[in-house]
Each structure stands twice: as structure tokens, then as C-alpha cells.
Interface confidence: medium
């Protein structure tokens, strides 16, 4: 997260760290007791590594009573996700067992009504991604409030040049932005999950390259079919 600040500890009980061989790889969001939603591209280079999900964490390294690492039973990427595109960049991870819920571990309601979030709406994005252009990785969860950007502006030739479909949404990126390592994490508007950070290699913090988020409401049928 660029231009953000340290989050209040355990105030986002839905927040997950998707880990590869014991190290943070991507963000994720607990959407059901045994399911975490993340981004499909996150695991493209996971190769033969051990994928796990950390729940109930604020610090990645310090012991915390609510922290627990879960093995992954099943990784279900969206069937239309492709290595070359940002479209359909969603992944559902089934935990090896139902998460132990409590004040620091709780699923987040996700948007089912397929309607765009109003431009200018302030939404919260959180993650353990890099905090500066030098690539410094934080130990504790960071967050930032970002205004939603209208699709027409986001699709300008100087911005994302038509790449933003109706299944994607944008947020402003003027110095405050999600970045590498935040992919798969939640964009939360009014206490509801609206978007998932896409995992492209986009430049961060440049206002002409807004943050791109996959709209979960657009994938409600797929999410429901996997969770069923």
C-alpha cells in the first residue's frame, strides 16, 4: 500500500495473507468460513510451492493469539482467467478446515447487486504489499482510503486505454494506491466487499494509471457455484 498508514490491529477480521512457502505472496479476503477469495494470477508462479492462508493477523512475523495458518485443500481459479489478461482475475481457496471465527477472524459480506459503485465513493484497501517504490515490505497490515474513479476516465487513452470492462472498476492512484503484494486483497466500500485487487504489473502511485479491481458482484454466480 503506497501513501497509506498502519491499520488498526485486527479491525479487518476478513483480511487474509496468501502465503507461498511461508512468505506473504498476496492478499485475500475471507468470504465464507472455509473460503478465501484472492486473485488468480497470484499463483501463476507458485510452481510447486506450499500455498497456505494466514488469518487473524496484523503482524506477519510477531506471535498473535488470533493468528492461524491454514493449509489449502483446493485452489479454484476462475475458469476464464488467462496469463496475459487482467480479466477474470479471481481465485477461490478452500481452507483445509473451517476457520475458527472470533473478533479477529470473520467473513466479509460481499456485493451481490451488479451495479457500479458511485464515482468518488471512498473505499478502503488493505494489504501487506510494498509501501514505497524501493520495494519495502511492511510487517504490519497497511491500509488506505481511495476514491472510486469512473470507468470512462479510467478508460482514457492516457490511462488504461479501454482495458477496463464492466466487470472491473478503478480507484484513484495519486500517490495513494495498492501495489505489489496487495493483489488479491479487498476493496471495501461501506463495509461491503466490492472489489479484489488485480495482480497485473501496473505502475503504482501514478495518477494516470489508476488501480484496477475486479468487481465481485459481476462474479456472484461463479462464487456461489464454487462455494455451494
Amino acid at each position: 500500500i503506497l501513501g497509506g498508514r498502519e491499520a488498526e490491529a485486527h479491525a479487518r477480521p476478513y483480511m487474509a495473507s496468501v502465503q507461498l512457502n511461508g512468505a506473504h505472496l498476496c492478499g485475500g479476503v475471507l468470504v465464507a468460513e472455509q473460503w478465501v477469495l484472492s486473485a488468480a494470477h497470484c499463483l501463476e508462479d507458485a510452481a510447486d510451492g506450499k500455498v497456505q492462508v494466514l488469518l487473524g493477523a496484523h503482524s506477519l512475523s510477531q506471535p498473535e493469539p488470533s493468528k492461524r495458518l491454514y493449509d489449502v485443500l483446493r485452489a479454484v481459479p476462475h475458469p476464464d482467467s488467462q496469463p496475459d489478461t487482467i480479466d477474470h482475475d479471481l481465485l477461490l481457496l478452500q481452507l483445509s478446515e473451517k476457520a475458527t471465527l472470533g473478533p479477529a477472524v470473520r467473513p466479509l459480506p460481499w456485493q451481490r447487486v451488479d451495479r457500479d459503485v458511485a464515482p468518488g465513493t471512498l473505499c478502503d484497501v488493505a494489504g501487506w504489499g510494498i509501501v514505497n517504490h524501493a520495494g519495502r515490505r511492511p510487517d504490519s497490515l497497511q491500509h488506505v482510503l481511495l476514491p472510486v474513479l469512473d470507468r470512462a476516465t479510467c478508460n482514457r487513452r492516457t490511462h488504461h486505454d479501454g482495458a477496463i470492462t464492466e466487470r472491473l472498476m478503478c480507484a484513484e492512484s495519486n500517490r495513494r494506491d495498492s501495489c505489489k503484494g496487495d493483489s488479491g486483497g479487498p476493496l471495501v466500500c461501506g463495509g461491503v466487499l466490492e472489489g479484489v485487487v488485480t495482480s497485473g504489473s501496473r505502475v503504482c502511485g501514478n495518477r494516470k494509471k489508476p488501480g484496477i479491481y475486479t468487481r465481485v458482484a459481476s462474479y456472484a454466480a461463479w462464487i456461489d457455484s464454487v462455494l455451494a
Partner: antibody, heavy 120, light 112 residues
Framework: EVQLVESGGGLVQPKGSLKLSCAAS????????MNWVRQAPGKGLEWVAR??????????YYADSVKDRFTISRDDSESMVYLQMNNLKTEDTAMYYC???????????WGTGTTVTVSS | DVLMTQTPLSLPVSLGDQASISCRSS???????????LEWYLQKPGQSPKLLIY???NRFSGVPDRFSGSGSGTDFTLKISRMEAEDLGVYYC?????????FGGGTKLEIK
């Protein structure tokens, strides 16, 4: 550049042994599972063996046709994968490819192959 | 072992035409993780094979959109919408859901 280079092929007599090597470069070798796939002259592809990464305890898997005769192994420090072939038969004559194994997909990077000929 | 049967063995196609290759598995190839690891590879003359399609219908990096995969259960199809000269070679289907992993026998795409 991601690259796999096989070596060690050659002519060997039936019941003989041969060890193939594969040098990997351009990627984090220790996190990938690796495979050997072969192709007999004028024939189709046949998967031979797979070895997983350290995080999966270097688990190995084999085609029935080579089980108990071939052994796949790896050296992560040198980014090498090997195929020790014992008790070779004429039907083992083939081009042997070293192949990288992805997460969502299987064989995403192939070497150029090394030829093994088993003949008396 | 899962037997992968490809048809036809040989397929003469005119440039610009559509080509369709079928692959049938002897049993379901849905993996225990819920994914179907059915892939298609192209081997051009004198070259190593290259991955085209993974998980039934997903194009790999750099693969043109004239290639598409479909199917479920035990029946799968690879389609090339507009045949180009560079598409010539032998196409193989492959299942990675059950050990031992198995390839189809191959389909040779030729110019009519």
C-alpha cells in the same frame, strides 16, 4: 531467459545404464516440480517421471513402463535434474525432454532434448 | 491408466479454414482439487512441444485467440478458427489429473 538444457544421451546396449542431466536457468528452480517426457522416433509423447520441490518432500512419480528401472532426482543448489536409467530396453530408445511443471498448467517450458539409443 | 484417444490421426486443412481435433479420455479427468487438467500441445517439425491450452479452455501466454479449447467429463475439443501455415504440426492432448499422466496419440495437421 528461462532455459532447460539436457545432456548425457548416447548409444547404450540393452540392460545397460545411462544418466541424463538437465541444467535449468532463468527461474527459481527450487520452487518448481520437474519432469522427463520422451518421444520414440516417429512416435508420440510419453510422460516418464516427475519430481516435486523440497516443500513437497521431493516426492517422485513414474510411468508404469519405467518404474523400478528409472530414478528421477534433483540438486537444487546446482539447478539440476537427473534421470538415472538402468536395465535399459530397446523400447527406451527416444528423445528425452526435460520439462518444467507450472501451478495451473503442467509442461510450460521444454528443453531441446537429448537422444538415447538402446541397441546391441 | 487413463487412455487418451485423439481423432483424427491426420487432418488435411486449407489455409484460412477451421480445424477441429477431438480427444476422449477413458475415464473422468476431474482432479480431486476440482480442476480438470486437460491440456493441448503443438509440436512443430523439428521442435520441442509447446503448451497451447491448459485447464480445458485457457490459452497459455502468447497463444493466438484463433485457438480455443472446450469440453468436460471425458470429451474435449481443440478448434483452430482460421488455419495459418505456422499452425502445421502434431497436436497432442494431455491429462494431468491422474498419475500416470498420459498424452493422446497425436493429430497431424497438414495443408490440403
Amino acid at each position: 531467459e528461462v532455459q532447460l538444457v539436457e545432456s548425457g544421451g548416447g548409444l547404450v546396449q540393452p540392460k545397460g545404464s545411462l544418466k541424463l542431466s538437465c541444467a535449468a536457468s532463468g527461474f527459481s528452480f527450487n520452487t518448481y516440480a520437474m519432469n522427463w517426457v520422451r518421444q520414440a522416433p516417429g512416435k508420440g509423447l510419453e510422460w516418464v517421471a516427475r519430481i516435486r520441490s523440497k516443500s513437497n518432500n521431493y516426492a517422485t512419480y513414474y510411468a508404469d513402463s519405467v518404474k523400478d528401472r528409472f530414478t528421477i532426482s534433483r540438486d537444487d543448489s546446482e539447478s539440476m535434474v537427473y534421470l538415472q536409467m538402468n536395465n535399459l530396453k530397446t523400447e527406451d530408445t527416444a528423445m528425452y525432454y526435460c520439462v518444467r511443471h507450472g501451478y495451473y498448467w503442467y509442461f510450460d517450458v521444454w528443453g531441446t532434448g537429448t537422444t538415447v539409443t538402446v541397441s546391441s | 491408466d487413463v487412455l487418451m484417444t485423439q481423432t483424427p490421426l491426420s487432418l488435411p486443412v486449407s489455409l484460412g479454414d477451421q480445424a477441429s481435433i477431438s480427444c476422449r479420455s477413458s475415464q473422468s479427468i476431474v482432479h480431486s482439487d476440482g480442476n480438470t487438467y486437460l491440456e493441448w500441445y503443438l509440436q512443430k517439425p523439428g521442435q520441442s512441444p509447446k503448451l497451447l491450452i491448459y485447464r480445458v479452455s485457457n490459452r497459455f501466454s502468447g497463444v493466438p485467440d484463433r485457438f480455443s479449447g472446450s469440453g468436460s467429463g471425458t470429451d474435449f475439443t481443440l478448434k483452430i478458427s482460421r488455419m495459418e501455415a505456422e499452425d502445421l504440426g502434431v497436436y497432442y492432448c494431455f491429462q494431468g489429473s491422474h498419475v500416470p499422466y498420459t498424452f493422446g496419440g497425436g493429430t497431424k495437421l497438414e495443408i490440403k
